[in-house]
């Protein structure tokens, strides 16, 4: 058993049918010695008396808020949550496996640049009685500080007969050095509590691996005289690291017809302009990627040809 926060405790339960459970001793936080009784949640049934209460925690029915009283007055509370291990595996019931980039991916994180700021998000089908707490550091043995805000509900969507909720959190490395080579990964730890269930989820990554630039901005077309060709120009996104001479991007320019089946013409360039043939009813799209490290491509920025 360990303390998650004041008066909230997590019992780690290795569960299987007929498991003996965990013996837990609760101590009433009071100088009083006599006349103390214990109850669980809203029940008035007295579970025991004395300054300590020994319970056998076998299942969620044994978890909840234990309260010690004296003469009708509440002395202290202890909320017991369960962290369940089954077949040697800690439960992962609260969050949805996003399955990308691989199975058992519960947390996904992205950074728009090398500033040390990143966003993580996760999915759940649970709508109520749910809390998250996020901690982060660079490295784990001698951790360097990363400050995370509160997790917030960022999107709701319907998937089949299921409603899915997306939560996200923003974190910032306290002493980020954008140009430095990373040797220790960022660690992100999410504590999730649903009703009386505790679970924890972790992710470990280098900022360079989670970079996803914003789409190029100011995408413009300039028709070339007496030609079907146009000059496409764009700019680095505002959120990208500076100076651009050091933090350079490469670009993919795509001409796409109205029909998805039409052949796509693609040009790759390190410049912020390109000359392409603009077909009728087509659109031109540009996306960006770090020039020197193959992390994610940005989303597309698009303009119609007409």
């Amino acid at each position: 058993i360990w303390e998650l926060k004041k008066d909230v405790y997590v019992v780690e339960l290795d569960w299987y049918p007929d498991a003996p459970g965990e013996m837990v001793v609760l101590t009433c936080d009071t100088p009083e010695e006599d006349g103390i009784t214990w109850t669980l949640d809203q029940s008035s049934e007295v579970l025991g008396s004395g300054k300590t209460l020994t319970i056998q925690v076998k299942e969620f029915g044994d978890a909840g808020q234990y309260t010690c009283h004296k003469g009708g007055e509440v002395l202290s509370h202890s909320l017991l949550l369960l962290h369940k291990k089954e077949d040697g595996i800690w439960s992962t019931d609260i969050l949805k496996d996003q399955k990308e980039p691989k199975n058992k991916t519960f947390l996904r994180c992205e950074a728009k640049n090398y500033s040390g700021r990143f966003t993580c998000w996760w999915l759940t089908t649970i709508s109520t009685d749910l809390t998250f707490s996020v901690k982060s550091s660079r490295g784990s043995s001698d951790p360097q500080g990363v400050t995370c805000g509160a997790a917030t509900l960022s999107a709701e969507r319907v998937r089949g007969d299921n409603k899915e909720y997306e939560y996200s959190v923003e974190c910032q490395e306290d002493s980020a050095c954008p140009a430095a080579e990373e040797s220790l990964p960022i660690e992100v730890m999410v504590d999730a509590v649903h009703k009386l269930k505790y679970e924890n989820y972790t992710s470990s990554f280098f900022i360079r691996d989670i970079i996803k630039p914003d789409p190029p901005k100011n995408l413009q077309l300039k028709p070339l005289k007496n030609s079907r060709q146009v000059e496409v120009s764009w700019e680095y996104p505002d959120t990208w690291s500076t100076p651009h001479s050091y933090f350079s991007l490469t670009f993919c320019v795509q001409v796409q017809g109205k029909s998805k089946r039409e052949k796509k013409d693609r040009v790759f360039t390190d410049k912020t302009s390109a000359t392409v043939i603009c077909r009728k009813n087509a659109s031109i799209s540009v996306r960006a990627q770090d020039r020197y490290y193959s992390s994610s491509w940005s989303e597309w920025a698009s303009v119609p040809c007409s």
């Epitope: 569960w15 049918p17 949640d41 299942e59 969620f60 029915g61 089954e86 019931d93 089908t125 649970i126 089949g160 007969d161 299921n162 409603k163 649903h194 009703k195 009386l196 269930k197």
Partner: nanobody, 123 residues
Framework: EVQLVESGGGVVRAGESLRLSCAAS????????MGWFRQAPGTEREFVGS????????YYADSVKGRFTISRDNAKNTVYLQMSSLKPEDTAVYYC????????????????WGQGTQVTVSS
Amino acid sequence: EVQLVESGGGVVRAGESLRLSCAASGRSFSNYEMGWFRQAPGTEREFVGSINRRGSSTYYADSVKGRFTISRDNAKNTVYLQMSSLKPEDTAVYYCAAGWLYPSSRSRDYDYWGQGTQVTVSS
């Protein structure tokens, strides 16, 4: 929200078998841990057993262990209670329940309940 409807109850003789079904509609059935409870007249609702969302693990009350089996078919949104070697003391209204906590024998850990189906075991 999940709606639960039990079926399969009836009158049987001691030693016989019966299979109860619980059909779920509404939000995704496979998200929920499912439980069976029963209530005899004048008594509190009693835990019978439960099954986890994947159907890979079950948990039973001592009074039914070895005689009752819970299973589920997530494709059919249905949970089953196979009862064998029935005894007169198994007579009760049987309720199906859906919740988020497995294992739990406590009724308040379940969020959704069916209306119940009567099982009577005569001697």
